[in-house]
Interface confidence: low
Amino acid sequence: ELLDPCGYISPESPVVQLHSNFTAVCVLKEKCMDYFHVNANYIVWKTNHFTIPKEQYTIINRTASSVTFTDISSLNIQLTCNILTFGQLEQNVYGITIISGLPPEKPKNLSCIVNEGKKMRCEWNRGRETHLETNFTLKSEWATHKFADCKAKRDTPTSCTVDYSTVYFVNIEVWVEAENALGKVTSDHINFDPVYKVKPNPPHNLSVINSEELSSILKLTWTNPSIKSVIRLKYNIQYRTKDASTWSQIPPEDTASTRSSFTVQDLKPFTEYVFRICCMKEDGKGYWSDWSEEANGITYEDRPSKAPSFWYKIDPSHAQGYRTVQLMWKTLPPFEANGKILDYEVTLTRWKSHLQNYTVNDTKLTVNLTNDRYVATLTARNLVGKSDAAVLTIPACDFQATHPVMDLKAFPKDNMLWVEWTTPRESVKKYILEWCVLSDKAPCIADWQQEDGTVHRTHLRGNLAESKCYLITVTPVYADGPGSPESIKAYLKQAPPSKGPTVRTKKVGKNEAVLEWDQLPVDVQNGFIRNYTIFYRTIIGNETAVNVDSSHTEYTLSSLTSDTLYMVRMAAYTDEGGKDGPEFTFTTPKFAQGEIEEQKLISEEDLGGEQKLISEEDLHHHHHH
């Protein structure tokens, strides 16, 4: 009979609001009280096995005790009622679980969408977390008809797809109810015609056709989605070149009504474009479709839009009356070539008389010219036609170049090597920039680029390496030939030298030593040598450091101690740090050169009656590594 509970707790399955107060009552049964000789005074309340302080208890009568909780903040509390029996043994009477949470908030931002070919789906914001099982029900009705409720699934509590087919051109009213053990709330009602909530399927079968007549256009065609029979459409057409990542857009006003084709203009010739299209209800009410599948097309070729960069070099070893000239040019980038370049046409005109035409497949042409002035022209040809001509004056042999650029500067920024100059006063047709890596091991093989005559700052467009010394030459080109070149050295990025200088003694005295070293080869400098530091020490002394200007190749150490072994090394510094060279040792002599004669004979008295000759070895104890 004691398996029957000794009492009970009321309420039995409480759900309470977080941060509210709650009172539970434990009522003992008479038979239990008699058996254990107890009453309500013997009741002990516990939560999650911890005893509740007596101050929270109230004895209602001999059979009942209550406990009160203020500001409940736990989501789940195990509450037990226990009695103290013989000898203070605790006997469990009854237990309940207090579940706490919050009532639902009013659902907000209710909206619906009709994906073409699917049933209407509505979604909403449910508000704060309730910590309780909360049911959301989407309700909908016509003025004359209630539709079946749509109960949101537990794993998607903020949306529901209705079970009825969408009817357009009839208004529907929709709202959401949220309910849990602590309350029930209703969202605002929304009233709309589902035709204004349509998201069409994307246009399909998008294709691209080019035009032989016009190299700047491509015609798009597509099939509209079926919803076209219910609503009028407008479109968003985007395009990009095949290797670009950002899209351009056709102006919306050009595609604001139902159609199944469109001609895109102002495109670049001989360029592959990628297109995509989406659509929505013409008046802008509703949703844009997803993008169509992409489609590619290539515009037709056009004649090259620019003359190639054009320059020349004269072989310094020329025969009497003749000189070898290498004409050279750069391939046009695709956006200027406008097609496949088939060949180049070069004409050479000697002063006042036509000379020669050449058709060349390469980007250089070597010709033998007399010492006269020549004018060279260059055009690039593709399937459609020729570029404008690039014109170069090759002056006569006795031509004196003048008017160089001024204030030439070169500096790195943003991983590029920039070159800047002040323009000469004369009218410059173009500038030629040449650059090469200075090296003791290899000749300076130049790359080059051309800039318009209006430019006075540019960066070198080549694959430049870090810690290499670039010799950069800028030549202004005038109508009558090139101006004087100006050159400057620069580094894309400096590094500490890869080797330090090797120091040696040029001359060693009793109290000073003249040190000398060679300038570091350019291949190991890795930057502009800004200064040297000489470190020297004796075996037992502290090291002394002396800074020396980078223009020097020798330095005199003074205030040295005679007859002493010195260790010396040198470091060279660029803007990015320094590098030590090998250590070198030398010994200062005991006597200066003039002191030898005075010291050679030491008097008898000093030697205790003997005369001793100091050996040369004693005087010149002087060794090099």
């Epitope: 500067k409 790195p412 800047e420 002040t422 200064n531 803007d575």
Partner: antibody, heavy 121, light 108 residues
Framework: EVQLVESGGGLVQPGGSLRLSCAAS????????MNWVRQAPGKGLEWVSH????????YYADSVKGRFTISRDNAKNSLFLQMNSLRAEDTAIYYC??????????????WGQGTTVTVSS | DIQMTQSPSSLSASVGDRVTITCRAS??????LNWYQQKPGKAPKLLIY???SLQSGVPSRFSGSGSGTDFTLTISSLQPEDFATYYC??????????FGQGTRLEIK
């Protein structure tokens, strides 16, 4: 992240001294030409002093010449301004600011948040 | 030393306006002119370098032009966050770094 953080500002009496420090991080400090620039309350920016990247060359505005000394410790990524014989007109926010020696044409692109110096009796 | 003169010294404008600030150098400084923006309690921030190059991270509504002695900073469509003080600075002959006296741009 490139950062310059000034410290050492405070209230000082006329004729007194202060030493401002600027700690650099996130940049190759030894490649930066550094400056102190100040801004008096409600006024514009006034250049105070400059030190070359290696610390060998120093320049001062006429208004502080002989009273202020700029220095740097590249090993510790630090810049300093020793201010002696302070006057009321030296009251300002002092910014340390720099540029990579190679990018000098491209403006002072690194600034500290400033430290306030008040000279008042 | 090269002197820099800004005009106007203050200017009232509304969001969406096009605003122009000018800076004149006492001698030719080629295109070595930089513009800074300073908001109250903050350090100056480099906006434009070399007269017309936009510093990384600066919105494209800011632009600069000019060379020699006359330079212009233009904000094509003023945004609320653009109300601040603007300074020009020459880097043709430095040190000293010389700034203009500043142009305070405030909401009309």
């Amino acid at each position: 992240e490139v950062q310059l953080v000034e410290s050492g500002g405070g209230l000082v009496q006329p004729g007194g001294s202060l030493r401002l420090s600027c700690a650099a991080s996130g940049l190759t400090f030894s490649s930066y030409e550094m400056n102190w620039v100040r801004q008096a309350p409600g006024k514009g920016l006034e250049w105070v002093s400059h030190i070359s990247s290696a610390g060998s060359t120093k320049y001062y505005a006429d208004s502080v010449k002989g009273r202020f000394t700029i220095s740097r410790d590249n090993a510790k990524n630090s810049l300093f301004l020793q201010m002696n014989s302070l006057r009321a007109e030296d009251t300002a926010i002092y910014y340390c600011a720099g540029y990579n020696y190679a990018y000098y044409y491209f403006g002072v692109d690194v600034w500290g948040q400033g430290t306030t110096v008040t000279v008042s009796s | 030393d090269i002197q820099m003169t800004q005009s106007p010294s203050s200017l009232s404008a509304s969001v969406g306006d096009r605003v122009t600030i000018t800076c004149r150098a006492s001698q030719s400084i080629s295109s070595y002119l930089n513009w800074y923006q300073q908001k109250p309690g903050k350090a100056p921030k480099l906006l434009i370098y070399a007269a017309s190059s936009l510093q990384s991270g600066v919105p494209s509504r800011f632009s600069g032009s000019g060379s020699g002695t006359d330079f212009t900073l233009t904000i094509s469509s003023l945004q609320p966050e653009d109300f601040a003080t603007y300074y020009c600075q020459q880097s043709y002959s430095t040190p000293p770094i010389t700034f203009g006296q500043g142009t305070r741009l405030e909401i009309k």
